[in-house]
Structures are given as C-alpha cells and as structure tokens.
C-alpha cells in the first residue's frame, strides 16, 4: 500500500508568504516543489502518523537582544520519509527550514547513514529571505541511482552552537535480485550427495530461488533466499545454476560445472633420462587427474629375459616430481617399465610400457690365484693371476688394475698399474728395498673396476739377499696368504 505523504502539525510555518519559484504555502507537500528535468517522482511514504505533534530536534527559543520577544523553536520542516525507486532512475529530495534573520552563518550539511556527504555530491542550498525569516531549502539529487545509494539521509544545521537535525529520508533503490552467494564448481564422488548454495537479495524482497540442473528445473516450487540444494548424487558431469526472482524480474547465476571424480588417466611419455649398471632414471607426463589430486605413483619394472621368472618389481613414489630413479637393477639387462598413478578414487591404468637397458657393470669377483715373487736379477716383482669368472652382466673384460703398496720404516706409498685384458701376468719394478710390497689386483670392464683380490705381501730384502719362493693367494679361498722369504 502507498501511504500519502502528509504534513504534521507544525511548530513554525514553512514560508510566511509567497516565495519565488512557485513554492507554495505551509500545507503543500514538498513533492510539488520543482524538480530537475527528467526526474520521475517515486513512491514516497510519510515517516510519521498524521496529526502527531512534531518531536524532532529543535533549537530552544531565545530572547532577542532587541527586547523580550520570544522566538519560536527552530526545526526542519517535515518531508517525505521513504522514497522507493528503481535502479538507474534519478531522484531529488530536500529538507527545508525557516530561520529568523537574527541568525547569521547558517549552513546545512547532508549525512547518509551517520556519515557526512562531502565532495562530489549534487547538493544545492537555496535561500529565500523575507522581513523576519529566511526560508532555506537544501536539495540533494542523485542521477542514475544504484543500490549503494540505499540508506537514511538527514540534514544537519548548526546555529549558535546548536545542531538541528531533520527527520531521516529513507532511500530504497529497487532492482533485479543481486547475488551475494552463487554456486561453486565442485568435484564430487560418483553417486554421493553434496550441497550447493545460492543467495540473492533485493530490494525488493522476497527473493525466490529456482535451481536448474542441465537446463531442467530442480524445484518447480521456489525457495526463499538463501537456498541450499542437496543434490542426491551424480553419475556424470552436470551444470547447475540458480535463478533469483523478485518483483522486478529475474537474475540467473553463472552456470557451474560439477565434475565426477574418477580414476586418473594413465601417464604418458615415459622416458629414460639416464642409465647406469644398476639404476635407470625415468620421467613421465601425468595423465588427467580424474578431478582428484594425485596421491602417489607406482613404477613397475619387468625384466625382459626369457630365462627370468617374469616377476614384476614395484617401486612406489610420490606423484611429484614426475621422475624416479629405479635402483637395485642388474647390470647389462633389459627391462620393460610402466608407470601408474593413483588419486582418492583409485589407480590409473599403466602407461604404455617402454624398454630400457642397464649398462655394463663392474666385475663382481676378483682375479684368482694371485702369486708374487721377486726376480732379484732384474730387480723387479713378478705377478701372476688367473682370469676371474665374470658374469655376462659385467661386460667385456678390458684389463686389470694392479695396486702395489711399498712399506718400509715410516714410509708407505701406493702405485697403480693398468694392464691389458690378454695378460695374466705383470712385472713391476722394485721401488724400495728392505720393505714389504703388498699387491692386489682387480679386473676392469667398461662398467668399472671390480673388487680387488686379497692382498699378497712379499718382503724385498736389501741388495744381496736371494729369494725365489713366490707369495701367493690360494685359488678358491680368501685365507691370509703365506709369505715365504
């Protein structure tokens, strides 16, 4: 219902007589004041009930210096209390007061919701002086109102340190519903219920909500905002939106996609970065995560060898970085490698398998039957050994490494010799007399140096001693060698 804007019993006339600008007397509503072109009068409501005496903020009457004449109390004239209008319309409202001419320097300020409106606002104050009083009309206009203009507006006037405050003018800007909360995209578990929320506000209220799923209305009977929709579960992706309706029309939220969590797609592009005799460094490109974060990955390794038992080695690793060093592999072996990753739903299928090979390894056994004897006539040490029984994985023998350590009183020095793979004997020059020479031999392949044989010691006497008996290591065992002088 629209309440007529009415004037109250007034403590003081609005205007004592006719004024310029077609302003009329006391009992004329301010709605009839001239307004800016294009301004449409809006619905207006009176703030108080007709006939009620005015009880606003007034300045107390005073005795003038000229004599004992009592001045009436000062108060703003009643005006419209509530203006309702649509967004983007223009609005103009005003407050007025008649001030005896004895008062100087009267200024009117506008306030909205307790804060003074300063700066770039369209406020105009007009003065209409007469013999005894000056009628002051303060106008405030807003072009193309927005929701942010909603609020309670008042005029304030300072006279002789007294503050006079007008009744509030409530501005209500109405428009289409405005969303304060829209549904959010989500990733959900298949066939599991979840909630979506939609909230919209006016004015005007109420705002009613309809939910739409894949273009079909979920609720034919609307719910008052805010609305929580419980979706009973989905088996496939769906798009949801909500419609907010009020008396001004309807606003549709953004459409949000609700995805169904699924197992990830298999990783792709598994590649080899580096191979050694016993390890392979791989990387992969993760597949689609199935709308659920990856938790970890599994690297599966099968030896490609007709004689192997076909067992699969599984190495678990974190999902990131997308790289893993596979260790504990055999040298010079072929492997088939696949990668699978998991999220909360489960494991992906395995990536396409790729072939990878480890490189040659170092020999795993030392040369056998190492014997050492002194050839005094030539002043050298003769060393002999047997070729080790190396596995295929160790690769091709490329030679031997001989370590000989010379120790005499307080002195120790180690020397290394390399000899070719066809040799099974070597000679080294005597470095120090009256010293112990300790010899160890290791087989060498492209994969590296194998373990050294157990040390064989021989004493090199001072010049003139004769010793032809060799020192040696027994063929199969690793017992301490016997030193014969």
């Amino acid at each position: 219902a629209i309440t007529e804007a009415r004037e109250e019993a007034k403590p003081y006339p609005l205007f004592p007589g006719p004024l310029p600008g077609s302003l009329q007397t006391d009992h004329t509503s301010l709605l009839s004041l001239p307004h800016t072109s294009g301004y449409q009068p809006a619905l207006m409501f009176s703030p108080t009930q007709p006939g009620r005496p005015y009880t606003g903020n007034v300045a107390i009457p005073r005795v003038t210096s000229a004599g004992s004449k009592l001045l009436p109390p000062l108060a703003f004239k009643h005006t419209v209390g509530h203006i309702i209008l649509s967004e983007h319309k223009d609005v103009k409202f005003n407050c007025s007061i008649s001030v005896p001419n004895i008062y100087q320097d009267t200024t009117i300020s506008w306030w909205k919701d307790g804060k003074e409106l300063l700066g770039a606002h369209h406020a105009i104050t007009q003065f209409y002086p007469d013999d005894e009083v000056t009628a002051i009309i303060a106008s405030f206009s807003i072009t193309s109102v927005q929701r942010s203009d909603n609020g309670s507006y008042i005029c304030k006037m300072k006279i002789n340190n007294e503050e006079i405050v007008s009744d509030p003018i409530y501005i209500e800007v109405q428009g289409l519903p405005h969303f304060t909360k829209q549904p959010e995209s989500m990733n959900v578990t298949r066939n599991t219920a979840f909630n979506l929320t939609c909230q919209a506000v006016g004015p005007p209220e109420p705002v009613n909500i309809f939910w739409v799923q894949n273009s079909s209305r979920v609720n034919e009977q609307p719910e008052k905002s805010p609305s929580v929709l419980t979706v009973p579960g989905l088996t496939e992706m769906a798009v949801f939106s909500c419609e907010a309706h009020n008396d001004k029309g309807l606003t549709v939220s953004k459409g949000v996609q609700i995805n169904i969590k699924a197992i990830p797609s298999p990783p792709t592009e598994v590649s080899i970065h580096n191979s050694t005799a016993h390890s392979i460094l791989i990387s992969w490109v993760p597949g689609f995560d199935g709308y659920s974060p990856f938790r970890n990955c599994s690297v599966q390794v099968k030896e490609v060898d007709p004689l192997s038992n076909g067992s699969v080695m599984i190495f678990n690793t974190s999902a990131s970085p997308h790289m893993y060093q596979i260790k504990q592999l055999q040298a010079l072996a072929n492997y088939s490698i696949g990668v699978s990753c998991m999220n909360e739903i489960g494991w992906s299928a395995v990536s396409p398998w790729i072939l990878a090979s480890t490189t040659e390894g170092a020999p795993s056994v030392a040369p056998l039957n190492v014997t050492v004897f002194l050839n005094e006539s030539r002043d050298n040490v003769d060393i002999r050994w047997m070729k080790p029984l190396t596995k295929r994985q160790a690769g091709e023998l490329v030679g031997y490494r001989i370590s000989h350590v010379w120790q005499s009183a307080g002195i120790s020095k180690e020397l290394l010799e390399e000899v070719g793979q066809n040799n099974s004997r070597a000679q080294i020059s005597v470095q120090v007399h009256n010293a112990t020479c300790t010899v160890r031999i290791a087989a060498v392949t492209k994969g590296g140096v194998g373990p050294f044989s157990d040390p064989v010691k021989i004493f090199i006497p001072a010049h003139g001693w004769v010793d032809h008996a060799p020192s040696s290591t027994p063929a199969p065992g690793n017992a301490d060698p016997v030193l014969i002088i």
């Epitope: 066939n191 894949n214 079909s216 979920v218 009977q221 609307p222 009973p232 579960g233």
Partner: antibody, heavy 118, light 106 residues
Framework: QVQLVQSGSELKKPGASVKVSCKAS????????MSWVRQAPGQGLEWMGW????????TYTDDFKGRFVFSLDTSVSTAYLQISSLKAEDTAVYYC???????????WGQGTLVTVSS | DIQLTQSPSFLSASVGDRVTITCRAS?????MHWYQQEPGKAPKLLIY???NLAQGVPSRFSGSGSGTEFTLTISSLQPEDFATYYC?????????FGQGTKLEIK
C-alpha cells in the same frame, strides 16, 4: 509423520462434477508443491500436473487441460482436484502426492476412487 | 514426452531370489525414481534420484543406471515385496511413469 488424507469415494453420473480434497498434515503445507496422479482401473500411473502451494498457480499436463482444476485452501492445508463434465473414462483412482525437488513424489494420499456411470 | 519402458512387465520369482527390473527411457533423463504399489494401496516411494533409498526402505532394494537405462534390484525377495513397481523420470517435463512391472510369487 507426514500424512495426506483424501476424501472418500465418489459415484457420479456423466456430465456431473466432482471435487476431491487432499488434507496435508505434519509439515509446512506451502513449502512443497502438490501433484495429482491418476490411475485408471488395472492401468498404470499418469501424472496430471501440480499446484504451487505458495502461489496457488496450477500447472496441467496436456491430457488434463480443460476440465480439470487444481485449487487450494492454505488455511486448512488442503489441495483440491475438481473435474467437470465427467465422462466414463474419468473413472479412476486419483492420488495427491507431495511434490519435492527432482520431481520426487515422496508422500501419497490413500487415493480417491471416482466412478462415472449412468 | 519421454516414454519409459519397463521390462519385464510380469515377473514370477520365489522368496530369496535376486530380481532385476529394467527401465529404458526414449531419451536421456537426469534421474529415475522407483515406486512400489501393493494391490489396493497407494504407491510408495522406494528409490529416488536413481540410487538413493527412501526413508524406511530396506537395504535389499538398490537402484543404478544413467542416461537411458536404469535398473531396480531386489537382492533377496521377501514375501512383502510381491507388488507392482513403477519407474518415473526426472529431467524432462512432463514427468512420466513406466507402465509397471508386476512381481508375482512363483
């Protein structure tokens, strides 16, 4: 416990009218729509349409436009189905059913048998 | 309108049997609901939104499916389960029902 209680059986002559009531209890009547479903003797279920209990706006399916009217008295939480110009083929059990999200009919009245016979 | 075809229309089974009723839609639908109707009584909601058990419905009833093909399964028939079952689609107005499947005691 939610209950929908329908009025009793009716025997009518062709051309007459009948009004079936459906009284709801134990929930806020205006929160859920009310649907009407017809089941002819020995036949399956046919959705006739529904009425918005908040606004009173009815919606009819194509086969039930014209002689069928849904109405409400929210003060007594009651929905009504009125059929005018009755025909023999209107003989059926008429059910009211509470209508919730996703077109679920979660509670049903016990049914009202309307027999049209001369 | 979307047509729903239930199969079989009649089904004879014994107590303890596992039975499956299928409902096929002429076009893809969002959800399927299932109702049970005992002779001379009003239908009762059994499963809503394809796979959700209505309040008070025993767990031997289950529903599944998507798109155009949906099923209602009763894992172990009880004497009180012998009734007529209807599917009903949500996704396209007007909402439509299947023709029904009558489950009888063998």
């Amino acid at each position: 416990q939610v209950q929908l209680v329908q009025s009793g059986s009716e025997l009518k002559k062709p051309g007459a009218s009948v009004k079936v009531s459906c009284k709801a209890s134990s929930y806020t009547f205006t929160t859920y729509g009310m649907s009407w479903v017809r089941q002819a003797p020995g036949q399956g279920l046919e959705w006739m349409g529904w009425i918005n209990t908040a606004s009173g706006v009815p919606t009819y399916t194509d086969d039930f436009k014209g002689r069928f009217v849904f109405s409400l008295d929210t003060s007594v939480s009651t929905a009504y189905l009125q059929i005018s110009s009755l025909k023999a083929e209107d003989t059926a059990v008429y059910y009211c059913a509470r209508y919730t999200n996703y077109g679920v009919f979660d509670y049903w009245g016990q049914g009202t048998l309307v027999t049209v016979s001369s | 309108d979307i047509q729903l075809t239930q199969s079989p229309s009649f089904l004879s089974a014994s107590v303890g049997d596992r039975v499956t009723i299928t409902c096929r839609a002429s076009s893809s639908v969002g959800y399927m609901h299932w109702y049970q109707q005992e002779p001379g009584k009003a239908p009762k909601l059994l499963i809503y939104a394809t796979s959700n058990l209505a309040q008070g419905v025993p767990s031997r009833f289950s529903g599944s499916g998507s798109g155009t093909e949906f099923t209602l399964t009763i894992s172990s028939l009880q004497p009180e389960d012998f009734a007529t079952y209807y599917c009903q689609q949500w996704g396209s107005l007007p909402f439509t029902f299947g023709q029904g499947t009558k489950l009888e005691i063998k």
